[in-house]
Amino acid sequence: LIIGFGISGRHSITVTTVASAGNIGEDGILSCTFEPDIKLSDIVIQWLKEGVLGLVHEFKEGKDELSEQDEMFRGRTAVFADQVIVGNASLRLKNVQLTDAGTYKCYIITSKGKGNANLEYKTGAFSMPEVNVDYNASSETLRCEAPRWFPQPTVVWASQVDQGANFSEVSNTSFELNSENVTMKVVSVLYNVTINNTYSCMIENDIAKATGDIKVTESEIKRRSHLQLLNSKAS
């Protein structure tokens, strides 16, 4: 969490941002809140990016002002206009690109004063893994697949019964570049699987950590998966 305060002149206002991560090829949100004002027409929101000449986005007098917007953000940004009055200056970013990573500044002017806060935005790719029994294999085998990751993640297998066991010798992981030549499909195969056990396929890079669990018994197969973003810090 980054909390910024205004500078001299008018009173300072508190602006708060949260470091976050964007998933390439999806929409993202850059979070920013501020001390609200009574009149929407008195609020100015400017989003800037370090190293970029034009503005990322500007909102003033109750509407978007696009004349100074930088080419790289063309048609890809919007604030939540109906929430500005309650102090939400968060930016919605469409079709996140790898190049969107960097340091952003959320700069606010209201009738109460000015304030700003920086935000670190990471970009990469992360997706939920799916673990299945590979019936085509000669022995009992599990196959863990996740369609989109970047940077290249690590893949680790674990089991409930054999806690602490190292499965690297009985697993094989491959990374296949996707068609846009940035993200990769992750496929990991675990051999010599025993029945009545829960196995976990854990995929992790510096942006996200995802786990796919599978429980195989005589009568049924149960699956569960979850994904968690790393390093979300508020400022």
Epitope: N23, E26, D64, L66, S67, G75, R76
Partner: antibody, heavy 120, light 107 residues
Framework: EVQLVESGGGLVQPGGSLRLSCAAS????????MSWVRQAPGKGLEWVAY????????YYSDSVKGRFTISRDNAKNTLYLQMSSLRAEDTAVYYC?????????????WGQGTTVTVSS | EIVLTQSPATLSLSPGERATLSCRAS??????LHWYQQKPGQAPRLLIK???QSISGIPARFSGSGSGTDFTLTISSLEPEDFAVYYC?????????FGQGTKLEIK
């Protein structure tokens, strides 16, 4: 050659449901945002919804929010529109459209459309 | 929501004449405006992107201009195949609104 072929339209009663499909070919489907745009008889174009290239992000027009669901299956190169709680005013030709790759928000390729009629 | 208003609703001209179609936005959208042509029974076709940028395969007689709130599509010398409905589209926000259309008909 880029091709978008819609299917699944038909006659449905008010309150009913329908699922439209759009089969894409001739381009790398998984790289593009996709949208549905509709056109009521004798009327203009109305954007309905978009889905991101990976399928994880969606956005809807206010007129269909909460009733329609856009989705995609990149393995099958297919875009979907699940329509429920249909109303007479949803009667239209539904087009699937590809958003431009570099900077979105305009549609460089369109399908020929599939007709949805909501009537009792 | 950004509202686009096109004028005139109908434009009656003869082949060889110059056509000027207007599109006005309810608030400034810089140059984030696109133009489409639609013929009866067909899907729309992209003509101009970002107010004035030409599209590959579209004849040079089609041109666009404008910025902010006022935009113009010009067809320098009408061909018989140009008689159709023309739509402008807001390319700025996440809700991608269209104008109501201008019908270009043969006089």
């Amino acid at each position: 050659e880029v091709q978008l072929v819609e299917s699944g339209g038909g006659l449905v009663q008010p309150g009913g449901s329908l699922r439209l499909s759009c089969a894409a070919s001739g381009f790398t489907f998984s790289n593009y945002y996709m949208s549905w745009v509709r056109q009521a008889p004798g009327k203009g174009l109305e954007w309905v919804a978009y889905v991101s290239s990976g399928g994880g992000s969606t956005y809807y027009s206010d007129s269909v929010k909460g009733r329609f669901t856009i989705s995609r299956d990149n393995a099958k190169n297919t875009l979907y529109l699940q329509m429920s709680s249909l109303r007479a005013e949803d009667t239209a030709v539904y087009y699937c459209a590809r958003e431009s790759y570099s900077q979105g928000n305009y549609f460089d390729y369109w399908g020929q459309g599939t007709t949805v009629t909501v009537s009792s | 929501e950004i509202v686009l208003t096109q004028s005139p609703a109908t434009l009656s001209l003869s082949p060889g004449e110059r056509a000027t179609l207007s599109c006005r936005a309810s608030q400034s959208i810089s140059d984030y405006l696109h133009w489409y042509q639609q013929k009866p029974g067909q899907a729309p076709r992209l003509l101009i992107k970002f107010a004035s940028q030409s599209i590959s395969g579209i004849p040079a007689r089609f041109s666009g201009s404008g910025s902010g709130t006022d935009f113009t599509l010009t067809i320098s010398s009408l061909e018989p195949e140009d008689f159709a409905v023309y739509y402008c589209q807001n390319g700025h926000s996440f809700s991608l609104t269209f104008g109501q259309g201008t019908k270009l008909e043969i006089k």
